[in-house]
């Protein structure tokens, strides 16, 4: 997260760290007791490493009573996701067992009504992604508030030049932005999961390149079918 602040510890109990060989790779969001939603591209970077999900964490390195690392029973990328595009950039991870819920571990309600979030709405993005262009990684969870940008502006030639589909949404990226390592993390508007950080190699913190998020409401049928 660029230009963010340290999040209040355990105030986002849905927040997950998707890890490979014990290292943070991507963000994720607990959407059901045994399921974490993330970005499909995260798996590409996992190669043949052991994928696990950390829940109940604020610090990645310090011991915390609520922290627990779960093995992944099944990884389900969206069937239409492709390595060369950010379309359908969603991944569902089934935990090896149901998560132990509590004040620091709780699923987040996700948006099912397929309607665009009003431009200008402030949404919260959190993650353990890089906090500087130099690539500095934080130990503790960071967050930032970002206003939703209308799709027409986001699709301007100077911005994303028509690449933003109806199944994506954008948020402003002026100094404050999601970045490398935040992919798969939640964009939360009004206490509801609206988007998932896409995992392209987009430049971060440049106002001409707004953040791109996969709209979960657009994938309600797929999410429901996997979770069923």
């Amino acid at each position: 997260i660029l230009g963010g602040r340290e999040a209040e510890a355990h105030a986002r109990p849905y927040m997950a760290s998707v890890q490979v060989n014990g290292e943070h790779l991507c963000g994720g969001v607990l959407v059901a007791e045994q399921w974490v939603l993330s970005a499909a591209h995260c798996l590409e970077d996992a190669a043949d490493g052991k994928v696990q999900v950390l829940l109940g964490a604020h610090s990645l390195s310090q011991p915390e009573p609520s922290k627990r690392l779960y093995d992944v029973l099944r990884a389900v990328p969206h069937p239409d996701s492709r390595p060369d595009t950010i379309d359908h950039d969603l991944l569902l991870l089934q935990l090896s067992e149901k998560a132990t819920l509590g004040p620091a571990v709780r699923p987040l309600p996700w948006q099912r009504v397929d309607r665009d979030v009003e431009p200008g709405t402030l949404c919260d993005v959190a993650g353990w992604g890089i906090v500087s262009h130099a690539g500095r990684r934080p130990d503790r969870l960071q967050h930032v508030l970002l206003p939703v940008l209308d799709r027409a502006t986001c699709n301007r030639r100077t911005h994303h030049d028509g690449a933003i589909t109806q199944r994506m949404m954008c948020a402003e990226s002026n100094r404050r932005d999601s970045c490398k390592g935040d992919s798969g993390g939640p964009l939360v508007c009004g206490g509801v999961l609206e988007g998932v950080v896409t995992s392209g190699s987009r430049v971060c913190g440049n106002r001409k390149k707004p953040g791109i998020y996969t709209r979960v409401a657009s994938y309600a049928a797929w999410i429901d079918s996997v979770l069923a």
Partner: antibody, heavy 120, light 107 residues
């Protein structure tokens, strides 16, 4: 020191137009959301609208959307409010304000205000 | 739009007293609430945002609390310069709306 200075308001006829400006200094203008807020004499505050960092997005009070236009010139550090088809109910003191750095719709610095009277 | 309801509309108090002003939102605004002070003929000044964060230069006798739909601003040991009007405002999204104001007068 952060400073916001609005242009002179004045008396205008109903149906006419008026453009207010607000000159900003003491901060990096293009790093902040900006807003206009108005206040009817002896009454409360009413948000008029906001403009984002580079002027690519503007947000307005629904009832003013068709008549008011907010713009900014980041080279000159000036915020504008173009008001058209003015009505007597637009009579108010108009303030420009800077959005707080993190919580964009909280306003941490305000201009001194400029009075606009719409009357025949 | 989210409606903000402030109470009381006016309040008389003496220097040294403690006063509390309340603000209710018509829907959940989480912690996105600001308070402003306005003196007669002057522009408003931000005193608290995000429910309890004091703006730069604001004395610690001011404190904000609440969450969701119910919020309050408390002023301990009132000083002469604290008298004026106070407005709450949600900064949750568009449009950010203000409460009707509370006029704090010297008793």
């Amino acid at each position: 020191e952060v400073k916001l200075v609005e242009s002179e308001g004045g008396l205008v006829q109903p149906g006419s137009s008026m453009k207010l400006s607000c000159t900003a200094s003491g901060f990096t203008f293009s790093d902040y959301y900006m807003a206009w807020v108005r206040q009817v004499p002896e009454k409360g505050l009413e948000w008029v609208g906001n403009i984002n960092y580079d002027g690519s997005s503007t947000y307005y009070l629904d009832s003013l959307k068709s008549r008011f236009i907010i713009s900014r010139d980041s080279a000159k550090n000036i915020l504008y409010l173009q008001m058209s088809s003015l009505k007597s109910e637009d009579t108010a003191t108009y303030f420009c304000a800077r959005g707080e750095d993190f919580y964009l719709y909280a306003m941490d610095y305000w201009g001194q205000g400029t009075s606009v009277t719409v009357s025949s | 739009d989210i409606q903000m309801t402030q109470s009381p509309a006016s309040l008389s108090a003496s220097v040294g007293e403690t006063v509390t002003i309340t603000c209710r939102a018509s829907e959940n605004i989480h912690s996105y609430l600001a308070w402003y002070q306005q003196k007669q003929g002057k522009s408003p000044q931000l005193i608290v945002y995000n429910t309890k964060t004091l703006a730069e230069g604001v004395p610690s006798r001011f404190s904000g609390s609440g969450s969701g739909t119910q919020f309050s601003l408390k002023i301990n040991s009132l000083q002469p310069e604290d008298f004026g009007s106070y407005y709450c405002q949600h900064h949750y999204g568009i449009p950010p709306t203000f409460g009707g104001g509370t006029k704090l007068e010297i008793k």
